[in-house]
């Protein structure tokens, strides 16, 4: 599992393998913070709940982040 509690960032390795949306349970977005200088995207897969860190620089994830920030600006008070 590419997660670590000993480093400041959650992800210690990043998968560049494309993710099939059908196999995704959920995607968690952890924004950059004082603890970790980069945004982290954690994918939980449907099978066995395996967690995978995705590349935030990939086109798909950039699209996703764009869509989330659009949604956020729509819903923010």
């Amino acid at each position: 599992v590419p997660l670590s509690r000993t480093v400041r960032c959650t992800c210690i390795s990043i998968s560049n393998q494309p993710v099939n949306p059908r196999s995704l349970e959920k995607l968690e977005i952890i924004p950059a913070s004082q603890f970790c200088p980069r945004v982290e995207i954690i994918a939980t897969m449907k099978k066995k709940g395996e967690k995978r860190c995705l590349n935030p620089e990939s086109k798909a994830i950039k699209n996703l982040l764009k869509a989330v920030s659009k949604e956020r600006s729509k819903r923010s008070p």
Partner: antibody
């Protein structure tokens, strides 16, 4: 409200290919999946495959594997379905439909979660009749 | 041959209650949800029921769905003449890795 508008009817010769387009309006194109189906005369609905534009990944029905290509152009909010090696058995009404939708929860927290809900095909194109005849 | 099995036809008189069944297996209905579609003559299909028993907005509550094991059911109560249409059940199949449909049920309102 999302709307899907498909390209017009086609008449093709056996052995040729056909490309049907499906243009989405009224929603964020990249935040849902587009499914392609067909219905031959007197037959039931048949799933051909789907694409999630945001991920650029297509899934295909085993029956059409190698003969169908589904793609999407985010700049024009248009999905395409190309079917090659046409025979008279491919004469059918072809539909695009919206399937999986991205839902964002915990949006205003610092850890938003994204799930993709496949709740059925709730928006359909008007259909494109493809006739294969020599 | 469709992966899901539906009766080819069903009928009823106005006001009656009609049930359409849809039988599958452990790789589709047994492990995934059932959707139902209505196809009126000359129109594109319309989603009637999703997630086994949920109705999209705008669908009258005369339409209801349920799932038990590897089968699903669509119930139309208070049948109306405008319900005369083809009805299809659908699910995702984990073995085939694709959406699968029933062959459709032609409902006639007598």
């Amino acid at each position: 409200q999302v709307q899907l508008v498909q390209s017009g009817a086609e008449v093709k010769k056996p052995g040729s290919s056909v490309t049907v387009s499906c243009k989405a309006s009224g929603g964020t194109f990249s935040s849902f999946s587009i499914t392609w189906l067909r219905q031959a005369p007197g037959q039931g609905l048949e799933w051909m495959g789907e694409i999630t534009p945001m991920f650029g990944i297509a899934n295909y029905a085993q029956k059409f594997q190698g003969r169908v290509t589904i793609s999407a152009d985010e700049s024009t909010s248009t999905a395409y379905m190309e079917l090659s090696g046409l025979t008279s058995e491919d004469t059918a009404m072809y539909y695009c439909a919206r399937d999986g939708r991205f839902d964002v929860s915990d949006l205003l927290t610092d850890k938003p979660k994204v799930t993709i809900n496949y709740n059925g095909m709730d928006v359909w194109g008007q259909g494109t009749l493809v006739t294969v005849s020599s | 041959q469709s992966v899901l099995t539906q009766p080819p036809s069903a009928s009823g008189t106005p006001g009656q209650r009609v049930t359409i069944s849809c039988s599958g297996s452990s790789s589709n209905i047994g492990s995934n949800t059932v959707n139902w579609y209505q196809r009126l003559p000359g129109a594109a299909p319309q989603l009637l029921i999703y997630n086994n028993d949920q109705r999209p907005s705008g669908i009258p509550d005369r339409f209801s769905g349920s799932k038990s094991g590897t089968s699903g059911s669509l119930v139309i109560s208070g049948l109306q003449s405008e319900d005369e249409a083809d009805y299809y059940c659908a699910s995702w199949d984990d073995s085939l890795n694709g959406r699968v449909f029933g062959g459709g049920t032609k409902l006639t309102v007598l």
